[in-house]
Structures are given as structure tokens and as C-alpha cells.
Interface confidence: low
């Protein structure tokens, strides 16, 4: 939720991180687009990395990329290549914890 | 404490080169980003270039692509900037800020001092 | 590339006032918009990411909110030390761009 993060600074001193939903898993088509969300939530604002069956995602300008929403992040990927299946991990740390949640492209 | 501190700037000429770098103190560095933000003397910022050091994943502004080179080595803490083919235009406080990877890439929570890169004959 | 058109370029406020300044995207751009305080020969400093989110740190009187492609930064109530220039800036694509700035000064 947008309230988790938008916090006065009076409020800054309470550090917490929460995995507010797993990751739903995908099965599409070639040539569509696919997009994953990881529903965290956290302060500090989480750093949040995402993997693919372990190894770094690396975003590709206008294809794949990962931004925020409302409720924690999104990875898009458009025009879906065989290649693109496999296990998806986010990773979310706000400094103290860590949370992670894992969905399927297939 | 987080802090990054710039260095490298100077006078240069036309067509020359400068290697800028950034020192980063006080987090883990592979776990963030560095953009590079330029201001010209009187005017706005201007977004020069973004390194993931996780990642190496690297990405430019069109004015600066082929020219400007963003690279980071984690074992020192520092990235650098390494500019060739200088114009004029160039000309500006360089600043290099911290970023949260991921969604938050374009957060810039942490900036440098900022050096100041001269262009001119 | 997306551009943002940020306005005023400049205004004049009195301490209490409420100041609003607007970020206006070419195209969508989610709600990956941040913007930054800068005071003169210093390093820009951020106040809100995520278009509404207020940064650790920052007095509760500054705010960002987001209308369609429109992103906007109010001071409540001004303060001295508010007066300074202000930034928007944006990500798309792995394109980062400000906005031209906005400079607040005393009326």
C-alpha cells in the first residue's frame, strides 16, 4: 500500500519490511508481454533485486525492465522469447531484513 | 555514514579527455547504483549516465553516448566516469549520486560535492 | 524519450505560504518520479520518490502527488530555508531526466 511508504520523518525511526503478497506465477505467449509483481512494502524504501533461476536480471531498454507501483514492484518483459521461462525471485532488504518471493514464467 | 566524493575535474581542451571518479564510503556498493548528474554553470541538472555494479549494466544519455564511458570497481569502492572527445558544452559540475537498485533506480537518496569539468582552448 | 515540462520556472512566495509547482510527462511514466531541493552551490537533495513518497528525513510539510501524467510537489506552508530551486525527475526505460527546474524566491 502508497501509505506504507509515505511516512513523515517524525515516523522514520520504526523500521519494518513485509512481503504483503506471493508472487502469482505467468504462463504466456510468444511475442506477448509478461509482467511479474513483487507486493512488498518497507522502511526504509526496500532495495529490491530480481533474479532469474538465481542469476542477476539485467534490464534491457524497452524490453525488460522493473519499476515501482503502488505496491512494491513490477518487471515487465515484452515480446516473450522462449528464453524468458524460468524461476523469478524478488528480493526485497530495507537494510535489516530481507524478504523473497518466487513465481514461474512458463 | 554514507559519502561519496568526487575528484578528476580540471581544465581541458577541445577533443580531450578526463577521468572523473567517485569514492563511495558508508554502504555496501554492490548493493547500489551511481548515476552521474551534470549541472552547466547557471542551469538545470542534466542525467549523464547510470552504473549497476551488481550487474554492470550501464546506460547513457544520448548527448554523452559513444563519448562517456560509466564503469565501477567494487573493490575499491569507486566509479568512474571516463569522458573523451570533450566539447565545450561539457562544460559543468559533475555530481555523482547514489541509487537504490531495481525500481528505485532513478533515487538519487545520496549526492557528492560535485567536480567541476572546464572546456575550453 | 519522454520529456518533463516543469512549471513555473520561477515564483515568488512569503514564509507560510502554500507553494505548488507541476511536472507535466510526455508519456506515462508510472509513478517513478522524484524530486530534489538544490540551494546554491550545493548538491541537490531528494524530498520524494515514487511520486508521493516522502523521503527519510524530510518535513512533513512538503508532498507529492500524481494526477495521470501530471506530478506535483506542494509546500504547505513555506519555510525560510524552503527557498531554493526545485527538480523533478523521472525514469523510463532507463532514461533519467529532470524537469528544468523551478526557483522559489522571497517576494
Known amino acids: 500500500p502508497t501509505s506504507s511508504w509515505n511516512i513523515s520523518s517524525e515516523l522514520n525511526k520504526d523500521s519494518y519490511l513485509t512481503l504483503d503478497e506471493p508472487m502469482n506465477n505467468i504462463t504466456t505467449s510468444l511475442g506477448q508481454t509478461a509482467e511479474l509483481h513483487c507486493k512488498v512494502s518497507g522502511n526504509p524504501p526496500p532495495t529490491i533485486r530480481w533474479f532469474k533461476n538465481d542469476a542477476p536480471v539485467v534490464q534491457e531498454p524497452r524490453r525488460l525492465s522493473f519499476r515501482s507501483t503502488i505496491y512494491g514492484s513490477r518487471l515487465r518483459i515484452r515480446n516473450l522469447d522462449t528464453t524468458d521461462t524460468g524461476y523469478f525471485q524478488c528480493v526485497a532488504t530495507n537494510g535489516k531484513e530481507v524478504v523473497s518471493s518466487t513465481g514461474v514464467l512458463f | 555514514e554514507v559519502q561519496l566524493v568526487e575528484s578528476g575535474g580540471g581544465l581541458v581542451q577541445p577533443g580531450g579527455s578526463l577521468r572523473l571518479s567517485c569514492a563511495a564510503s558508508g554502504f555496501t556498493f554492490s548493493w547500489y547504483g551511481i548515476h552521474w548528474v551534470r549541472q552547466a554553470p547557471g542551469k538545470g541538472l542534466e542525467w549523464v549516465a547510470y552504473?549497476?555494479?551488481?550487474?554492470?549494466?550501464?546506460y547513457y544519455a544520448d548527448s554523452v553516448k559513444g563519448r562517456f564511458t560509466i564503469s565501477a570497481d567494487t573493490s575499491k569502492n569507486t566509479a568512474y566516469l571516463q569522458m573523451n572527445s570533450l566539447r565545450a558544452e561539457d562544460t559543468a559540475v559533475y555530481y555523482c549520486?547514489?541509487?537504490?537498485?531495481?525500481?528505485?533506480?532513478?533515487?538519487?537518496?545520496?549526492w557528492g560535492q560535485g567536480t567541476l569539468v572546464t572546456v575550453s582552448s | 524519450d519522454i520529456q518533463m515540462t516543469q512549471s513555473p520556472s520561477s515564483l515568488s512566495a512569503s514564509v507560510g505560504d502554500r507553494v505548488t509547482i507541476t511536472c507535466r510527462a510526455s508519456q506515462s511514466v508510472s509513478s517513478a518520479v522524484a524530486w530534489y531541493q538544490q540551494k546554491p552551490g550545493k548538491a541537490p537533495k531528494l524530498l520524494i520518490y515514487s511520486a508521493s513518497s516522502l523521503y527519510s528525513g524530510v518535513p512533513s510539510r512538503f508532498s507529492g502527488s500524481r494526477s495521470g501524467t501530471d506530478f506535483t510537489l506542494t509546500i504547505s506552508s513555506l519555510q525560510p530555508e524552503d527557498f531554493a530551486t526545485y527538480y523533478c525527475q523521472q525514469a523510463y526505460d532507463q532514461l533519467y531526466t529532470f524537469g528544468q527546474g523551478t526557483k522559489v524566491e522571497i517576494k
Open positions: 549520486a547514489r541509487s537504490h537498485f531495481g525500481h528505485y533506480d532513478y533515487v538519487m537518496d545520496y
Open positions: 552504473i549497476d555494479s551488481y550487474t554492470s549494466s550501464t
